[in-house]
Amino acid sequence: ATKLTEEKYELKEGQTLDVKCDYTLEKFASSQKAWQIIRDGEMPKTLACTERPSKNSHPVQVGRIILEDYHDHGLLRVRMVNLQVEDSGLYQCVIYQPPKEPHMLFDRIRLVVTKGFSGTPGSNENSTQNVYKIPPTTTKALCPLYTSPRTVTQAPPKSTADVSTPDSEINLTNVTDIIRVPVFN
């Protein structure tokens, strides 16, 4: 079967995944955006989302996930800090656009986290845990419960990369406090 395009990131425990999702700013600047994990045979699960409406360059932190939406650049920055092996899996950025189904942004991210550091002497490996200090005012947004099954079964575009790394279960520490409320009818 054809797959949606994936980009693979291989990182070590404790490091930071830092990706940027490009969107059409005229259409989606203030739309609510989310970071989701996709498990085989399941609907994507929202792990964190921006506020509604999304605020410009205002960090939203849910556990170890930090979202920043840069309206003037049409860019959603997603960081997962202090990565754990259990974080390995397939992720995607989406834009909520009720009443239509969420709009998926390219590419999906295949995250592979392994144990131990791979640094050279003198490299600042632990900086990923220290560089980004999120202010205490950081908000936790309410994430919609809504996820269309069609986001799993939609006709995929031509894949430019096939990554066959198996999915792993994920258990993101401190993410259980996401409040999920059905904000769409």
Partner: antibody, heavy 119, light 108 residues
Framework: EVQLLESGGGLVQPGGSLRLSCAAS????????MSWVRQAPGKGLEWVST????????YYADSVKGRFTISRDNSKNTLDLQMNSLRAEDTAVYYC????????????WGQGTLVTVSS | EIVMTQSPATLSVSPGERATLSCRAS??????LAWYQQKPGQAPRLLIY???TRATGIPDRFSGSGSGTEFTLTISSLQSEDFAVYYC??????????FGQGTKVEIK
Amino acid sequence: EVQLLESGGGLVQPGGSLRLSCAASGFTFNAYAMSWVRQAPGKGLEWVSTISGSGSTTYYADSVKGRFTISRDNSKNTLDLQMNSLRAEDTAVYYCAKVAGSNFFFDHWGQGTLVTVSS
Amino acid sequence: EIVMTQSPATLSVSPGERATLSCRASQSINANLAWYQQKPGQAPRLLIYGAYTRATGIPDRFSGSGSGTEFTLTISSLQSEDFAVYYCQEFILFPPHTFGQGTKVEIK
């Protein structure tokens, strides 16, 4: 297979104009940002300009700002670079590059087209 | 603007030996670094991105490491086709995204 094919290079006098084009195939063109990167003879790589997948956001190096314009036609899968007020220091091989879907690095490159600015 | 500095400018290595190339950023870029290889008369080719991840089709003798401001590209056992110029590039957030000046790996 991703393919990027540049055209439009050539010899132009200082102060003149040139339009470079890049024909893209093998990927969902409108989903990815695209860039131009140049390399002066015997020198290193220099980023020139980037345009988002939708074309709504553009970025330019200070050295070309106000003189170069990047654009794209997603219906034709083409990327353009309009170069005006050309200077001798703009002489370089210009590469069309596909930006990765997750970050601003370049995962595929064209073979380049040579622009020579000389009187 | 972030300045990327590569060292050494030229590295003379015998085939089969290990090559270690360095790249330093003027400020922390986390792991937002890519490495490219360029052979004479050819376009650059992506080797490593995110400081550690090998691009599709890149042999495992190429490996990247480092984070923050100090990065390393290691070629564990140089093959004849590896003699080329190598560039690092940062992509921390928005353009401009700067390249290092390059390291030429030549046959000793």
